[in-house]
C-alpha cells in the first residue's frame, strides 16, 4: 500500500530474466553486463560503457558494449551527435550537402556518401526545393535570363546580339537588324 | 543411476597449478548446474564454484576468484576447476556436485556428490 | 556473506532417542515464502548426502526419522529415533545467495 511495487520476479517479463543461475534485473542503457546477480531477482553488476562504446537499450546479456561508428571522411560524412553511452554516433552531410544513397532500397542504416547541393543561384535559377534529404530542385531561370538549351542564358544587352523566340518572350524585346 | 567421478588431484608445490576433472554419468548433464566444493583435512565444508547451465556463467568466493576457472563442456559431459597459483590453504578434497533446481523459487540444492579427490598444496 | 552458526558442535544421544541439531543464519534465507536452506549428512570417509532441502522437504530415499523445521533465520534438524547408522556430521547450508555457505559441522555420536 502507497509507494510503487518493484516489478514482479518471474524470468518471464520485460525486467527479469535468467542469467546464469538467477533470474536478474538487466543493465540499463548505457552500461554492460560485468557480472550477473548473485541471488534470486537480484541486480546485476553493471558498468558505464567506456568511451567511444554505447548500449542504447536495457540489456539482460550485453557483457561488452558497441563501438561507436565513425563517420567516413571519404564520403565526406560528418558528426551531426557525437556518440554517447546510450546512442551511437549520428553521420550525416554538412550543410550544403546532401545525402545520396549508395543502394537502391535506402533506410536509416544504408552506406551513403555526401554530395554539394546545387547552386541555383549559380545556375541563374530560382530555388525550388532547398536541399535537405535530397539535392536541391531548380525552378525556372532567374528574371534576365531565358532557357536555352539545359541552362539558362543573360539576356542580351545591346541589339547586337541575337535574340530567337523564347529569349524575345523572356527579355521583352526582338532582334533588331 | 547418476554417477560423478572426480580425478586430476595430486601433490603441487606452492604457486603451481592443476586441473581437476568431473565426469558425469546418469542425467542430462547440459540441463544442470554443477559445483565444486572443498574439505580441507579435519575440517568442514566450503564452497569453490558454481557453473550454470545454459549459459555457462561461472561464480565463485573471494578466496579463489582470479586463481580459479570453472569449465564445462556438455559434449564430454564433464566438468573442469583450473586452479592456479596455488596456497597451502587450498589442500583440501575437492568434491564435484550436481546443483538440482528446486520448482521456481531458483533454489538450488547439492544432490548429488562424487567421492572427492585430494589435493596437496606443500613445497 | 552469511554465516551459518551450527549447535552444538557435538552431540551424543543414546539409540533410540531423538537427537536435535540448530542452525543459525545471520540474515533472513527466505525468498518467495521458501527457506533457501539444506541440510547434509557427511559418514566418515564418504562424501556429503542431501538430507533436507527447502528447510523441510526431505530427500526422496532419506528414512522418514529425519525431518527439517524452521524458517526466517532458524532451523532444526530432527532425528526422532537414532540409529546406529545416522553416525556422522551434519552441516546446514544456505543457498539464499552467494557466496553459498555451510555451518560448521556438528558431529553427532551414540551415548
Known amino acids: 500500500q502507497g509507494g510503487t511495487r518493484s516489478p514482479r520476479c518471474d524470468c518471464a517479463g520485460d525486467f527479469h530474466k535468467k542469467i546464469g543461475l538467477f533470474c536478474c534485473r538487466g543493465c540499463p542503457a548505457g552500461h554492460y553486463l560485468k557480472a550477473p546477480c548473485t541471488e534470486p531477482c537480484g541486480n546485476s553488476t553493471c558498468l558505464v560503457c567506456p568511451q567511444d562504446t554505447f548500449l542504447a537499450w536495457e540489456n539482460h546479456h550485453n557483457s561488452e558494449c558497441a563501438r561507436c561508428q565513425a563517420c567516413d571522411e571519404q564520403a565526406s560524412q560528418v558528426a551531426l551527435e557525437n556518440c554517447s553511452a546510450v546512442a551511437d554516433t549520428r553521420c550525416g552531410c554538412k550543410p550544403g550537402w546532401f545525402v545520396e544513397c549508395q543502394v537502391s532500397q535506402c533506410v536509416s542504416s544504408s552506406p551513403f556518401y555526401c554530395q554539394p547541393c546545387l547552386d541555383c543561384g549559380a545556375l541563374h535559377r530560382h530555388t525550388r526545393l532547398l536541399c535537405s534529404r535530397r539535392d536541391t530542385d531548380c525552378g525556372t531561370c532567374l528574371p534576365g535570363f531565358y532557357e536555352h538549351g539545359d541552362g539558362c542564358v543573360s539576356c542580351p544587352t545591346s541589339t547586337l546580339g541575337s535574340c530567337p523566340e523564347r529569349c524575345a518572350a523572356v527579355c521583352g524585346w526582338r532582334q533588331m537588324f | 543411476e547418476v554417477q560423478l567421478v572426480e580425478s586430476g588431484g595430486g601433490l603441487v608445490k606452492p604457486g603451481g597449478s592443476l586441473r581437476l576433472s568431473c565426469a558425469a554419468s546418469?542425467?542430462?548433464?547440459?540441463?544442470?548446474?554443477m559445483s565444486w566444493v572443498r574439505q580441507a583435512p579435519g575440517k568442514g565444508l566450503e564452497w569453490v564454484s558454481t557453473?550454470?547451465?545454459?549459459?555457462?556463467?561461472?561464480y565463485f568466493p573471494d578466496s579463489v576468484k582470479d586463481r580459479f576457472t570453472i569449465s564445462r563442456d556438455n559434449a564430454k559431459n564433464s566438468l573442469y576447476l583450473q586452479m592456479n597459483s596455488l596456497r597451502a590453504e587450498d589442500t583440501a578434497v575437492y568434491y564435484c556436485?550436481?546443483?538440482?533446481?528446486?520448482?521456481?523459487?531458483?533454489?538450488?540444492?547439492?544432490?548429488?556428490w562424487g567421492q572427492g579427490t585430494l589435493v596437496t598444496v606443500s613445497s | 556473506d552469511i554465516v551459518m552458526t551450527q549447535s552444538p558442535d557435538s552431540l551424543a544421544v543414546s539409540l533410540g532417542e531423538r537427537a536435535t541439531i540448530n542452525c543459525r543464519a545471520s540474515?533472513?534465507?527466505?525468498?518467495?515464502?521458501?527457506?533457501?536452506m539444506q541440510w547434509y549428512q557427511q559418514k566418515p570417509g564418504q562424501p556429503p548426502k542431501l538430507l533436507i532441502y527447502?528447510?523441510?522437504n526431505v530427500e526422496s530415499g532419506v528414512p522418514d526419522r529425519f525431518s527439517g523445521s524452521g524458517s526466517g533465520t532458524d532451523f532444526t534438524l530432527t532425528i526422532s529415533s537414532l540409529q546406529a547408522e545416522d553416525v556422522a556430521v551434519y552441516y546446514c547450508?544456505?543457498?539464499?545467495?552467494?557466496?553459498?555457505?555451510f555451518g560448521q559441522g556438528t558431529k553427532l555420536e551414540i551415548k
Open positions: 556436485a550436481r546443483d538440482r533446481i528446486y520448482g521456481s523459487v531458483q533454489y538450488y540444492a547439492m544432490d548429488y
Open positions: 546418469g542425467f542430462t548433464f547440459s540441463s544442470y548446474a
Open positions: 557453473i550454470s547451465d545454459g549459459d555457462s556463467y561461472s
Open positions: 540474515e533472513s534465507v527466505e525468498f518467495s515464502g521458501t527457506s533457501l
Open positions: 527447502a528447510a523441510s
Open positions: 547450508q544456505q543457498s539464499r545467495k552467494l557466496p553459498y555457505t
